[in-house]
């Protein structure tokens, strides 16, 4: 059995109250695909949400978060409070990163500093609450007599290609 409603275009619905003719979606509703028997209610961006894209007859509204918050979840289903760099959000609010950890963003958790010694390197720049450590050359590379400079490339005579 063929669906009589399958050809009603997006932005409309197949109106059973009017002998299954296509009717436009009412205000504040939409249908993003054809053949719909009802239109969906538009999402409303209220409170900590702000409107990024208005609802139309064929597409839902899209929300962002107001200043001081950031989106979480698919299609920005939740807004989470921003913290400062060097902090993470806990149940009790924004807390500074513990020593040995950092967060360089306004969201997410504090992560441990890189352990340079695991790669046989030394700490070039110490870490902070906001920044990871910067690893430098290995201690062996810096021992007396070790040259960190690369030898110059041999000069080529003009008109000769290398062997």
């Amino acid at each position: 059995l063929q669906d009589l409603c399958s050809n009603c275009p997006a932005g409309t619905f197949c109106d059973n109250n009017r002998s299954q003719i296509c009717s436009p979606c009412p205000p504040n509703s939409f249908s993003s695909a054809g053949g719909q028997r009802t239109c969906d209610i538009c999402r409303q961006c209220k409170g900590v949400f702000k409107t990024r894209k208005e609802c139309s007859s064929t597409s839902n509204a899209e929300c962002d978060c107001i200043s001081g918050y950031h989106c979480l979840g698919a299609e920005c289903s939740m807004c989470e409070q921003d913290c400062k760099q060097g902090q993470e959000l806990t149940k009790k609010g924004c807390k500074d990163c513990c020593f040995g950890t950092f967060n360089d963003q306004k969201r997410g958790i504090c992560r441990p500093w890189t352990n340079c010694s695991l790669d046989g390197k030394s700490v070039l720049v110490n870490g902070t609450k906001e920044r990871d450590v910067v690893c430098g050359p290995s201690p062996a590379d810096l021992s007396p007599g070790a040259s960190s400079a690369t030898p110059p490339a041999p000069a080529r005579e003009p008109g000769h290609s290398p062997q």
Partner: nanobody
Framework: EVQLLESGGGEVQPGGSLRLSCAAS????????MGWYRQAPGKRREFVAA???????VYAESVKGRFTISRDNAKNTVYLQMSSLRAEDTAVYYC???????????????WGQGTLVTVKP
């Protein structure tokens, strides 16, 4: 309330032409398919032509190449241009609002009252 009002019928000689109009109101015309049907004396009502909102058209084999269906969404009107008319085209012609914007295996939701077309020498 859906209203469909046909006009343009009349008497014409074989080989002649007529243009039928169907003025629609009471619904969103531009998103719905419209069709023309006819009923000859003593016969069942039969499909003639249909046009969907996207202007795809379908015709009965008996009228292909002779009849043309068109629509003007600004005027909420559907037309049937009939040429090379034959005696067997004599019938009452009805405008129909089709369910679900469908022109394939169409089903009529609302009918007009019809307009008579007579083809005779």
């Amino acid at each position: 309330e859906v209203q469909l009002l046909e006009s343009g019928g009349g008497e014409v000689q074989p080989g002649g032409s007529l243009r039928l109009s169907c003025a629609a109101s009471g619904f969103s015309f531009s998103i719905n398919a419209m069709g023309w049907y006819r009923q000859a004396p003593g016969k069942r009502r039969e499909f003639v032509a249909a046009i969907e909102s996207g202007r795809n058209t379908v015709y009965a084999e008996s009228v292909k190449g002779r009849f043309t269906i068109s629509r003007d969404n600004a005027k909420n009107t559907v037309y049937l241009q009939m040429s090379s008319l034959r005696a067997e085209d004599t019938a009452v012609y009805y405008c129909g609002l089709l369910k679900g914007n469908r022109v394939v295996s169409p089903s009529v939701a609302y009918w007009g009252q019809g307009t008579l077309v007579t083809v005779k020498p």
